[in-house]
């Protein structure tokens, strides 16, 4: 003989794969205080329970260790705790109260559990700026994970030199020592929920601050093709009266400030151009000598020089006859 009672709350609950959900259940108020029995949660249509407090009863292999009956008859609590939710848990469940000493039991109404795809993704937090050569701690966190679930596995992937910092159930710390070449590369934190076999990842692009490593000058001479110098050049022959365009470029992040100087400048010298471009419309004696491009950056500066040697046109040097 069965007595029916209604589960309080919604008729269905939604949980994301790998996470936890509590199916609320309160024992019927009509239950006599003297009623002594065991509680069983069943999957609709099954005769082996998914969770019970009966030590003599087997539970389903699929739910063992993940489904727990939170049994507290004094507080009328018969709730079902589900952790590491799996797609296969998507079903209707009901609670049954049975007693070996009483001639009747209690059966609850059904409640549907809907298991959805995991849409949450890990968060990656970076404190301040990443600076080349300086260790920084990045944290990958999954604050939406429930404490009672199987701890997730954190996995990191970075091209930069790294080492592992501390971890908790909900987060993992990575110490990264980025290099200039790691700027704009991707870093991935992946989180796997082994209890449910679900994997999520988040990928971010690293923004690494670094001083200029390379500075170069491209030289545009008249209509001839440009050529590039990558190191200090002792002497570059130029024809008198020729137009010359010197283009300086450097790496560095954020971009270095480029400026041109005549000669070898002191630190506080005044530039002849405040950009990376130096236009010499007509090369003459005033332009003979050294020109320096300086790439200035908060993390360090770099400069490159070239020396112009002016070839005079024969008629330009001849006196009047």
């Amino acid at each position: 003989q069965e007595r029916r009672f209604q589960l309080e709350g919604p008729e269905s609950l939604t949980v994301q794969e790998g996470l936890c959900v509590l199916v609320p259940c309160r024992l019927p108020t009509t239950l006599p205080a003297s009623y002594y029995g065991y509680g069983y949660w069943f999957l609709e249509g099954a005769d082996v329970p998914v969770a019970t407090n009966d030590p003599d009863e087997e539970v389903q292999e699929e739910t063992r260790g993940r489904f727990h009956l939170l049994w507290d008859p004094r507080r009328k609590n018969c709730s079902l705790s589900i952790r590491d939710a799996r797609r296969r848990d998507n079903a209707a469940y009901f609670f049954r109260l049975k007693s070996k000493w009483m001639k009747y039991g209690y059966t609850s109404s059904k409640l549907s559990v809907r298991v959805m795809a995991l849409t949450h993704r890990p968060n990656i937090s970076i404190p301040g700026t990443l600076e080349s050569g300086h260790p920084s701690n990045l944290t990958c966190s999954v604050p939406w994970v429930c404490e009672q679930g199987t701890p997730p596995i954190f996995s990191w992937m970075s091209a930069a030199p790294t080492s592992l910092g501390p971890r908790t159930t909900q987060s993992s710390v990575l110490t990264i020592t980025p290099r200039p070449q790691d700027h704009s590369t991707n870093l991935t934190c992946q989180v796997t929920f082994p209890g449910a076999g679900v994997t999520m990842e988040r990928t971010i692009q690293l923004n690494v601050s670094y001083a200029p490593q390379k500075v170069a000058i491209s030289i545009f001479q008249g209509n001839s093709a440009a050529f590039k110098i990558l190191q200090n050049t002792s002497s570059l022959p130029v024809l008198e009266g020729q137009a010359l365009r010197l283009l300086c470029d450097a790496d560095g992040n954020p971009p270095a400030h480029l400026s041109w100087f005549q000669g070898f400048p002191a630190l506080n010298a005044t530039p002849i151009s405040n950009t990376g471009v130096l236009e010499l419309p007509q090369v003459g004696s005033a332009e003979e000598g050294d020109f320096t491009c300086r790439a200035q950056h908060p993390l360090g500066s770099l400069q490159i020089s070239l020396s112009l040697f002016v070839h005079w046109k024969p008629e330009g040097r001849a006196g009047g006859v």
Epitope: W156, M157, T162, S163, L164, L174, N186, L187, T199, E201
Partner: antibody
Framework: EVMLVESGGGLVKPGGSLKLSCAAS????????MSWVRQTPEKRLEWVAS????????YYPDSVKGRFTISRDNAKNTLYLQMSSLRSEDTALYYC?????????????WGTGTTVTVSS | DIQMTQSPASLSVSVGETVTITCRAS??????LAWYQQKQGKSPQLLVF???NLADGVPSRFGGSGSGTQYSLKINSLQSEDFGTYYC?????????FGAGTKLELK
Amino acid sequence: EVMLVESGGGLVKPGGSLKLSCAASGFSFSTYVMSWVRQTPEKRLEWVASISGGGSNTYYPDSVKGRFTISRDNAKNTLYLQMSSLRSEDTALYYCARREVVVYWYFDVWGTGTTVTVSS
Amino acid sequence: DIQMTQSPASLSVSVGETVTITCRASENIYSNLAWYQQKQGKSPQLLVFSAKNLADGVPSRFGGSGSGTQYSLKINSLQSEDFGTYYCQHFWGTPLTFGAGTKLELK
């Protein structure tokens, strides 16, 4: 038993293409960063490519960047390496390798290898 | 890129001897170093990671040590199954690079 089995190797002309596969079994494939490492005829080991567990992140050395593409199909537990614009220096025994699970770039499981020969 | 220089290139030894293989990195790799063993016709197998930790199932006669740029692998009381080629590999950022290998041959 954890296993990695490569296939798809063969003889190809310079400039040609080839796609290698690696079938994984015995472990949770999607949890791991996977890589390709090759061994030259001179027995030197060279890292070729790596891919994150979910496939959103890939890395290559300069020697193959722009020519090789690593990918994975987690539903099939399979890793791939698409090689194009092949050169004679790509001739090698190609291994599929599993990276340690958390962060460090060493390889705790290696496949048996598949041979790629680039020759005219 | 970090260069890994392994020495010696080859070594002729007898069973029962103790051997040491060294690996030098072109810059500090902060113990981010692995050692692999490769037997003839087989795939490499992880022996040591993070300079000194033995991989699962590796006999205790193997030992890794070192720091900074200098690392070594020591094999005490060499057994017949230890013959083969040994490689070091740094994992202090990419690109990952390997040493050229040290071939252990039976004297």
